[in-house]
């Protein structure tokens, strides 16, 4: 029961996390204009991984995709790649984990197969979460670097007349969504891995078999009994083949050429 709950909760947490990673990747507010030094034009610029948006003083918002923009930073491409890898791995992980769920019966799937699938999906969720966290963190680092560079070169102009007031960018909502979503996916993955341990079939139990001598000779044949798991049909230590090994009720008093005294 606890295993099913852990697995189910891990799946739900990962599902929410991956939905968050997708949302963060699609969001436009990865970097937002720092309004500390609000320019006279009263515009608000925010940028995402795929497009840049500007809300003008009239309230009109215009967004443009970066496909027209040459020379995008390699770091931005790296962040895009990390987020996409995270989404793909997470999506595959979700697909695998659906079939691995203990509460869902698919044909005659063994518990060992479900355990393996749970572990696989768990590892995928962990890697997916790490990709998202890494992607968001790389972007955040890029923002911090850009912020201090912009602060140093904020005002540029000629002949005492300020000609440009450079925009400083700060953390956008997508960064926080990404961090939280990545964390949730990671936690979900860990929960799936924990659930996997409980799903795996128990190791072979060797049941003790007692031998009592009813006469002067003990009937014993090495290898006469199969090791029992406790789940099979040989739980009552019945005779497996004729050859000297007997259960307590079947021991005969006359010696055999195979007997060891």
């Amino acid at each position: 029961m606890a295993v099913t709950a852990c697995q189910g909760l891990g799946f739900v947490v990962s599902l929410i996390g991956i939905a968050g990673i997708i949302a963060a990747t699609c969001m436009d507010q990865w970097s937002t204009q720092d309004l500390y030094n609000n320019p006279v034009t009263a515009v608000f610029n925010y940028q995402g991984l795929w497009r840049s948006c500007v809300r003008e003083s009239s309230g009109f918002t215009e967004c443009r995709g970066y496909f027209t923009l040459l020379g995008l930073p390699a770091m931005l491409q790296a962040v895009r790649a990390l987020m996409i890898v995270g989404i793909v791995l997470g999506a595959i992980g979700l697909l695998v984990s659906i079939f691995a769920l203990k509460c869902i019966r698919i044909g005659s799937m063994e518990d060992s197969a479900k355990a393996n699938m749970t572990l696989t999906s768990g590892i995928m969720f962990i890697v997916s979460g790490l990709c998202a966290i890494a992607g968001v963190s790389v972007f955040a680092n890029m923002l911090v670097t850009n912020f201090w560079m912009s602060t140093a070169n904020m005002y540029t102009g000629m002949g005492g007349m300020v000609q440009t007031v450079q925009t400083r960018y700060t953390f956008g909502a997508a960064l926080f969504v990404g961090w939280v979503a990545g964390g949730l996916t990671l936690i979900g993955g860990v929960m799936m891995c924990i659930a996997c341990r409980g799903l795996a079939p128990e190791e072979t139990n060797y049941k003790a078999v007692s031998y009592h001598a009813s006469g002067h000779s003990v009937a014993y044949k090495p290898g006469g009994f199969k090791a029992s798991t406790g789940f099979g049909s040989n739980t009552k230590n019945k005779k497996i083949y004729d050859g000297g090994a007997r259960t307590e009720d079947e021991v005969q008093s006359y010696p055999s050429k195979h007997d060891y005294v």
């Epitope: 009263a42 610029n45 500007v54 003008e56 009109f60 215009e62 923002l143 000609q163 450079q166 925009t167």
Partner: nanobody
Framework: AVQLVDSGGGLVQAGGSLRLSCAPS????????MGWYRQAPGKQRELVAS???????TYADSVKGRFIISRDIAKNTVYLQMQSLKPEDTAVYYC??????????????WGQGTQVTVSS
């Protein structure tokens, strides 16, 4: 580096007209909130007129009905058609716009200014 280049100023008689134009030099990604400001000697800089990409225009009360701001989106150029000019319109006229030049690169850009003198 991107710059806003404004032109069209000069000396004109009262009641006359002038047309100012402003465009960015260099490669830009997008341009927003283009407008004109003016600064008379010993006075604060004030907004004359501005236009946004959706066509919304704003005018200072003192120029309403006399000045018309227009924009050529294809050329990223803004114009200020000034008619019925008065001596109090004498000032240095500055073009202003918010320009996005690239990824995490934008700013509030100003032109170098063009002198408009209205003689009575």
């Amino acid at each position: 580096a991107v710059q806003l280049v404004d032109s069209g100023g000069g000396l004109v008689q009262a009641g006359g007209s002038l047309r100012l134009s402003c465009a960015p030099s260099g490669k830009i990604f997008s341009i927003h909130n283009m407008g004109w400001y003016r600064q008379a000697p010993g006075k604060q800089r004030e907004l004359v007129a501005s236009t946004t990409n959706d066509g919304t225009t704003t005018y200072a009360d003192s120029v309403k009905g006399r000045f018309i701001i227009s924009r050529d989106i294809a050329k990223n150029t803004v114009y200020l058609q000034m008619q019925s000019l008065k001596p109090e319109d004498t000032a240095v006229y500055y073009c202003n716009a918010f320009i996005v030049t690239g990824f995490m690169a934008s700013g509030d850009y100003w032109g170098q200014g063009t002198q408009v003198t209205v003689s009575s």
